[in-house]
């Protein structure tokens, strides 16, 4: 039977007797930086190409015995996860293997350095069809390690690593931390997360998604025909790698950016129990578990977007948190979280030529985020529409006045440390969807964009108290881009999305008593492009 | 042991009429960094990436090296360069003392120096 | 191209040792073991073992167990099965192929064991 | 006798489709993706023609196709020529070891 990370990677579509999808990766190389591998096991013979790059330290301690089998463990399990034959992700993906662990998995930064390097000048000597890079290894936050993989990442070469087992913030390692990898978190059978020992899988803002990564079945390098289940977030890591392998061997052009999109749109959402990761990291930490697309053709038409979390901005009165896009994304809004519910909003920026999400801290707040909406939309032409504070009673408002461009987010900005003290809030008038309306006290920005054929429509979800949280979702075929509350009270604590649902939280005011005018709103923008979808027919 | 001796002599030699002092000192305001990792256990002192500005081309970044050396044995320090970075980023990997890193730091062409440190299987 | 070549035939009397070798040239040597296969005369074929050019590690099928060692020259790329012990039943050709996945075949040796 | 199981001859005229099965257990073709299949010419070494179940190495004819189903695999010649008279082994992985089929004689009529 199946073995259970290889069913759960796969769309109920293919589940026959055996884990057989198409196209197996056959136009995808796949780097591995790891320890040496039994090149030669059946499981993967001849799909490994061994390298003559070796940067390893030495082993530690002095009666170290230098066992092959024990040298070979971690590197041909990947391997097998990557492309084995029978317990594999992408049976067709070939790959190159790059030695920078040691006989006891201990590798260096500089090590590491010099094998992406190798990389990059074989990319360069022999350019081939597409790449992915997989680091199933992780060290401290290393400002270098990250620089390199933005550079490989820019060169088109798709980089997928380990969270890291340290049961810790991700973004504390790298190259787990680098903004560009894809960053692999891992997860069991029942869908919880890892546990390693005392340890278990990294979490927080820097994961992209979790995979399997307990109990997975791949080669042993203790002889040529044995298996072992080895778990960890390398394994995880793997998984992904073989599905991007998939994924782009059946398109070779994606890019990055939009192999990423994919990666979350087609992954299984919400399945993750987070009650396991610690309080203040579940709203950051991604509840996505990888999966390979139904089919490998025709998500071209969806308008992807994913939510990007900024790092906390510390509790300065001063201090702002950034959320940045990658550079072929679209920031179509921008929205703000504060815990304390102590902030000052939000406001989309440009910063050296691109659109930022920056978050506001407030007097005696214990820190912001920004949180930033950011989608895949060709050939768009984006904008940010300011109104300065209103101060009359109506509130403060500001709509896309040009031709042909649709509201795609809101955010609202102020100076006042508390706007929940300056009454009264005002709920936006209906039937103006291209208009942003919010506290007359603070200045609103409207994100415009036109693309073609491009849509959006708002949602609005209220209840007469807070209770904690309010959602509304965009309905199948609409993607939500833009997410945030009305009105901009104190005991708003913030707007974030999740996948397609607008989630705005606020403090349960039941204990302090509440009034019908502390309503609480939750706007969603949905969008989808009439473009996409007729092209992708077209394709058809 | 030998060898090493011998790389250091070499060295002196090849250098001796390289100018002292500092040329081509970095542009005014931009300091070079240096970063090390966090996690004690995992730091590597005594390799160090010295990480040069974007645009550097591979024979400067050879020259910055050289220049260290140079500048590091009239200090009657031995370093050795394990590898010169280009394709990704322009720098070199360089075994030497942590005394030289305010010497390093002030090198042309530097951006920032990280001291290298250990990366592990997950 | 890729490409294993075999030993001449050999003749040998029963309780006799035989070693076959197979050069191989053409690919990433560590990247496939090799697979010994042999033929009896108008019979099927019979999977002897295979040995791993990457650190020399066997695989022995259980027939033959204890009469066969495979073993390899990783200077000269060749790869070596001898049988002792032999018996008339061991006549037959005797072919190396690449891998498990015996994508490429030497030419076969064949050989005979007769008093 | 062989682990798989294969008729010992079939026999089709040219342009005609032929298919031979290969029946194994669980452990064997059932259990692994690694079914293979080989032509052979009296006097030559076997040639692969179908590895993995169903995939043909390059310079193979897409005459020549390969499938399974629970424990049994199958190839299947169409457009059958004179020159794919020969013998047709199978053969599989267990989970230490390789297993052939005794063998398939075709007969192209």
């Known amino acids: 039977s199946i073995p259970w990370n290889l069913e759960r990677i796969t769309p109920p579509r293919y589940r026959a007797d055996e884990y057989q999808p198409p196209d197996g990766g056959s136009l995808v190389e796949v780097y591995l930086l790891d320890t040496s591998i039994q090149s030669d096991h059946r499981e993967i013979e001849g799909r490994v190409m061994v390298t003559d790059f070796e940067n390893v330290p030495e082993e530690d301690g002095t009666r170290f015995h230098r066992q092959a089998s024990k040298c070979d463990s971690h590197g041909t399990h990947l391997a097998g996860v990557v492309s084995g034959r029978d317990a594999g992700v992408a049976k067709g993906a070939s790959m190159r293997s790059l030695r920078v662990l040691n006989c006891q998995g201990k590798g260096t930064v500089s090590g590491t350095l010099i094998g992406l390097e190798f990389i990059r000048k074989s990319q360069l000597v022999q350019p081939v069809g597409p790449l992915v890079v997989l680091l199933p290894l992780a060290g401290g936050y290393s400002r270098v390690l990250n620089a390199a993989c933005q550079r490989l990442a820019r060169a088109g070469v798709v980089l997928v690593t380990a969270a890291g087992n340290f049961r810790d913030d991700a973004c504390l390692y790298s190259p787990a931390s680098a903004p560009e990898v894809i960053t692999v978190g891992a997860t069991n059978a029942q869908d919880q997360p890892v546990t390693l020992g005392t340890l278990g899988t990294n979490f927080g803002r820097c994961v992209d998604l979790f995979a399997p990564g307990e109990d997975i079945i791949g080669a042993s390098s203790d002889c040529s025909t044995c298996f072992v289940s080895q778990s960890g977030t390398s394994q995880a890591a793997a998984h992904v790698a073989g599905i991007a392998a998939m994924m782009l061997s059946a398109e070779p052009e994606l890019t990055l950016a939009e192999l990423r999109q994919r990666l979350i749109h087609f992954s299984a959402k919400d399945v993750i129990n987070e009650a396991w990761f610690p309080e203040d990291q579940r709203v950051l930490t991604p509840n996505l578990v990888a999966a390979l697309p139904p089919s490998t053709h025709g998500a071209g038409w969806q308008l992807f977007c994913r939510t990007v979390w900024s790092a906390h901005s510390g509790p300065t009165r001063m201090a702002t948190a950034i959320a940045r896009c990658a550079p072929d994304e679209e920031l179509l809004s921008c929205s703000s979280f504060s815990r304390s519910g102590k902030r000052r909003g939000e406001r989309m920026e440009a910063q050296g030529g691109k659109l930022v999400c920056r978050a506001h801290n407030a007097f005696g707040g214990e820190g912001v985020y920004a949180i930033a909406r950011c989608c895949l939309l060709p050939q768009a032409n984006c904008s940010v529409h300011t109104a300065p504070p209103a101060e009359a009673s109506m509130g403060t408002r500001v709509h896309c006045h040009q031709q042909g461009h649709v509201l795609t987010g809101c955010s609202s900005h102020w100076e006042v440390e508390d706007l929940g003290t300056h009454k009264p809030p005002v709920l936006r008038p209906r039937g103006q969807p291209n208009q942003c309306v919010g506290h007359r006290e603070a200045s609103i920005h409207a994100s415009c964009c036109h693309a073609p054929g491009l849509e959006c429509k708002v949602k609005e979800h209220g209840i007469p108290a807070p209770q904690g949280q309010v959602t509304v979702a965009c309905e199948e075929g609409w993607t939500l881009t833009g997410c945030s509350a009305l009105p901009g009270t104190s005991h708003v604590l913030g707007a974030y999305a999740v996948d397609n649902t607008c989630v705005v939280r606020s403090r349960d005011v039941s204990t302090t008593g509440s009034t019908s005018e502390e309503a609480v709103t939750a706007v969603a923008i949905c969008c989808r492009s009439r473009h996409l979808a007729q092209a992708s027919q077209e394709l058809q | 042991q030998e060898d090493e001796d011998g790389d250091y002599e070499e060295l002196v030699l090849a250098l001796r009429s390289e100018e002292d002092g500092l040329a081509e000192a970095p542009e005014h305001g931009t300091t070079a960094t240096f970063h090390r990792c966090a996690k004690d256990p995992w730091r590597l002192p005594g390799t160090y990436v010295v990480v040069l500005k974007e645009e550097t081309h591979l024979s400067q970044s050879e020259r910055t090296a050289r220049r260290l050396q140079a500048q590091a044995a009239r200090r009657g320090y031995l370093t050795k360069i394990l590898h010169v970075f280009h394709g990704l980023l322009p720098g070199f990997l360089v075994k030497m003392s942590g005394d030289l890193l305010e010497l390093a730091l002030k090198l042309p062409h530097v951006d920032y120096i990280e001291e290298d440190s250990s990366v592990f299987a997950q | 191209q890729v490409q294993l070549v075999q030993s001449g035939a050999e003749v040998k009397k029963p309780g006799a040792s035989l070693k076959v070798s197979c050069k191989a040239s053409g690919y990433s040597l560590t990247s496939y073991g090799i697979s010994w296969v042999r033929q009896a005369p108008g019979q099927g074929l019979e999977w002897m073992g295979w040995i791993s050019a990457y650190n020399g590690n066997t695989n022995y099928a259980q027939k033959v167990q204890g009469r066969v060692t495979m073993t390899t020259d990783t200077s000269t790329s060749t790869v070596y099965m001898e049988v002792r012990s032999l018996r008339s039943d061991d006549t037959a050709v005797y072919y190396c192929a690449r891998g498990y996945g015996m994508d490429v075949w030497g030419q076969g040796t064949t050989v005979t064991v007769s008093s | 006798q062989s682990a798989l199981t294969q008729p010992a001859s079939v026999s089709g005229s040219p342009g005609q489709s032929i298919t031979i099965s290969c029946t194994g257990t669980?452990?064997?073709?059932?259990?692994?993706?690694?079914v293979s299949w080989y032509q052979q010419h009296p006097g030559k070494p076997p040639k692969l023609m179908i590895y993995e179940v169903s995939n043909r190495p390059s310079g193979v004819s897409n005459r020549f196709s390969g499938s399974k189903s629970g424990n049994t695999a199958s190839l299947t010649i169409s457009g059958l020529q004179a020159e794919d008279e020969a013998d047709y082994f199978c053969s599989s992985y267990t989970s230490t070891s390789m297993v052939f089929g005794g063998g398939t004689k075709l007969t192209v009529l």
């Open positions: 669980s452990s064997d073709v059932g259990g692994y993706n690694s």
